[in-house]
Interface confidence: low
């Protein structure tokens, strides 16, 4: 027959859940072992795991609510293709009977007493009621029980006095305007309003009570706005830590405008919400080494050689600076201390000259003095031999750029009677005075 | 022993050591690694490798041409060959002279 | 702090060959590099400084190369007694620093 296939057993209750669907035989259900069944909805959940025993089920309540009793527990015999121990078939309960007692003994009745006397009237003027009283002893009843009807009676008395009036409150007045325009200043706005004892007033004879509670209450205002609070300075912070490694920095101390903070247009605290300090590390700062300018170029040499001068000899000069000024351990000079060079030394070289163009107009000299002059010059210039102008000084090196050095012996033929320099000279004109300027400011 | 300090002297002959000349501590660890800890200049002036925290102190003595390496502290880490050494470090920062070494062991 | 790498930590060589010893610098110093030899038992001792200038009484034979990071370090004809320890060394900025080192082993 088919049956309904889930997916699951829940060993707990005993119950399928993750419905697969119907209409599959227990054998298709059951290729997996995980899974249960059921032969109608609602009905017994088999799992298809082998079977085995259920956990018992809790002791059904004792057949007796009082006395000895008995009650029943229950096993059932759940799984699919094959049997339980005992040889038992799936869906098949296994039953456990026991003794039980919810309560020793059963209830018995008692019966009542004779009636006691009436008791004073419930009030002391005017109409009220009377009560009177029996007790359930005679016999007492037994194991929680008791007895029938009820433990007193009452009924109707009459004082034959009258009653006082006793004072009530008449409705509260109006309310009396507010004692303040603003809430939170120095006295909290109240409101106050009063009503009378008159509704109504305590009689006199016999005597009424007068009214109870006070005649007038008071409320805070609500609505009004806040008052302004004026700012007030909180206390300088700490001193901030000094921002520097080195020499003098500066320090800060602030403070915030909430001691208290300003509220509902009250004004701002008045003056500065930080001041500063010089601090002094003591410890000087670094200073980073500067190059000097480069020192003039050795003379130009070749080793083993005593003077390569006036030939077509390459050789080699150096020149050197000096890393001046670190001090406090501050970053040395970067870059290289010496600087070497190829060259071709023309040194008191006899070399064919030219004349030069006239050279730019020279500053007026003495710039202060009297009478100051320009100069220009036109210069016996040597014309230099046509040497390679790079070399290979190593295999493998590459071309290096050779440079001529040295104080040559230029010849030119004579001009305006000089062999190396012709100079004009001209007068300055409109001279203006030197004056300090600082002093001119004054 | 771990936790003690340990102080070393180096002794300078042929050399003021308030000329210009840099006097410096190095330490080389069982490994062979060099670590330079710091120096004292001839004006008195110290620099200290920022490793060693504030645990080191160089100082010296004048009169008596040396200087002095104070490390507290020490732990089994500080087992090292000690040198001193001096350098000209406004002209020429390298450190061409050396001491012989003190070989410290630091064990419980 | 500035990183030495030295390489290679080891090298084995023979007498009368050549061979060289690399040091890169992590950030660039010029040419404020020294090179220092270490006999065993013995305390280092100045061989190159300024990345090129031979030092005082040390022979031609070692040579030093190189400015910014990379920097060489050359032994052109190896003697018995060249087989120690080399070490390079920058004091371009506090604290000095130096390479790990390399051993030069006889084949």
């Known amino acids: 027959d088919p049956v309904l296939c889930f997916t699951q057993y829940e060993e707990s209750s005993g119950k399928c859940k993750g419905l697969l669907g119907g209409g599959v035989s227990v054998e298709d259900c059951c290729l997996n072992t995980a899974f249960a069944y059921q032969k109608r909805s609602g009905g017994l959940c088999q799992p298809c795991r082998s079977p085995r025993w259920s956990l018992w089920s809790t002791w059904a309540p004792c057949s007796v609510t009082c006395s000895e009793g008995s009650q029943l527990r229950y096993r059932r015999c759940v799984g699919w293709n094959g049997q339980c121990s005992g040889k038992v078939a799936p869906g098949t309960l296994e039953w456990q009977l026991q003794a039980c007692e919810d309560q020793q003994c059963c209830p018995e009745m008692g019966g009542w007493s004779g009636w006691g006397p009436w008791e004073p009237c419930s009030v002391t003027c005017s109409k009220g009621t009377r009560t009177r009283r029996r007790a359930c002893n005679h016999p007492a009843p037994k194991c929680g029980g008791h007895c029938p009807g009820q433990a007193q009676e009452s009924e109707a008395c009459d004082t034959q006095q009258v009653c006082p009036t006793h004072g009530a409150w008449a409705t509260w007045g109006p309310w009396t305007p507010c004692s303040a325009s603003c809430h939170g200043g120095p006295h909290e706005p109240k409101e106050t309003r009063s009503r009378k004892c008159s509704a109504p007033e305590p009689s006199q004879k016999p005597p009424g009570k007068p009214c109870p509670g006070l005649a007038y209450e008071q409320r805070r205002c609500t609505g009004l706005p806040p008052c302004p609070v004026a700012g007030g300075w909180g206390p300088w912070g700490p001193v901030s830590p000094c921002p520097v490694t080195c020499g003098l920095g500066q320090t800060m101390e602030q403070r915030t405008c909430n001691h208290p903070v300003p509220q509902h247009g009250g004004p701002f605290c008045a003056g500065d919400a930080t001041r500063t300090h010089i601090c002094n590390t003591a410890v000087p700062c670094p200073v980073d080494g500067e190059w000097d300018s480069w020192g003039e170029w050795s003379p130009c040499i070749r080793r083993n050689m005593k003077s390569i001068s006036c030939q077509e000899i390459p050789g080699q000069q150096s020149r050197g600076r000096t890393c001046r000024g670190r001090k406090f351990d501050g970053h040395r000079c970067a870059g290289q201390q010496q600087d070497i060079r190829h060259c071709y030394s023309i040194q008191h070289c006899p070399l064919k000259g030219s004349w030069s163009e006239w050279s730019t107009w020279g500053l007026c000299m003495p710039p202060c003095g009297p009478n100051p002059t320009r100069a220009r010059q036109r210069l016996c210039t040597p014309l230099l031999p046509k040497y390679p102008p790079t070399v290979s000084m190593v295999e493998g090196q590459g071309e290096k750029n050779v440079t001529f050095w040295g104080r040559p012996l230029p010849r030119c033929e004579e001009l305006q009677g000089q062999k190396l320099v012709v100079e004009e000279k001209r007068p300055c004109l409109h001279v203006p005075a030197c004056k300090d300027p600082e002093e001119e400011e004054l | 022993k771990p936790s003690q300090s340990l102080s070393l002297t180096c002794s300078v002959t042929g050399y003021s050591i308030t000329s210009t000349y840099y006097w410096n501590w190095i330490r080389q660890f069982p490994g062979n690694k060099l670590e330079w800890m710091g120096y004292?200049?001839?004006?008195?002036?110290?620099k200290y490798n920022p490793s060693l925290k504030n645990r080191i102190s160089i100082t010296r003595d004048t009169s008596k041409n040396r200087f002095f390496l104070k490390l507290n502290s020490v732990t089994t880490e500080d087992t090292a060959t000690y040198y001193c050494?001096?350098?000209?470090?406004?002209?020429?920062?390298?450190?061409?002279?050396w001491g012989q070494g003190t070989l410290v062991t630091v064990s419980a | 702090d500035i990183v030495l790498t030295q390489s290679p930590a080891s090298q084995s060589a023979s007498l009368g060959e050549s061979v060289t010893i690399t040091c890169l610098a992590s950030?660039?110093?010029?040419?404020?590099l020294a090179w220092y030899q270490q006999k065993p038992g013995k305390s280092p001792q100045l061989l190159i400084y300024a990345a090129t200038s031979l030092a005082d009484g040390v022979p031609s034979r070692f040579s030093g190369s190189g400015s910014g990071t990379k920097f060489s370090f050359k032994i052109s004809s190896l003697q018995a007694e060249d087989f120690v320890s080399y070490y390079c060394q920058q004091l371009y900025s506090t604290p000095w620093t130096f390479g790990g080192g390399t051993k030069l082993e006889i084949k």
């Open positions: 004292i200049s001839y004006d008195g002036t110290n």
């Open positions: 950030q660039t110093i010029g040419t404020w």
């Open positions: 050494a001096g350098d000209d470090y406004d002209r020429s920062p390298w450190f061409a002279y």
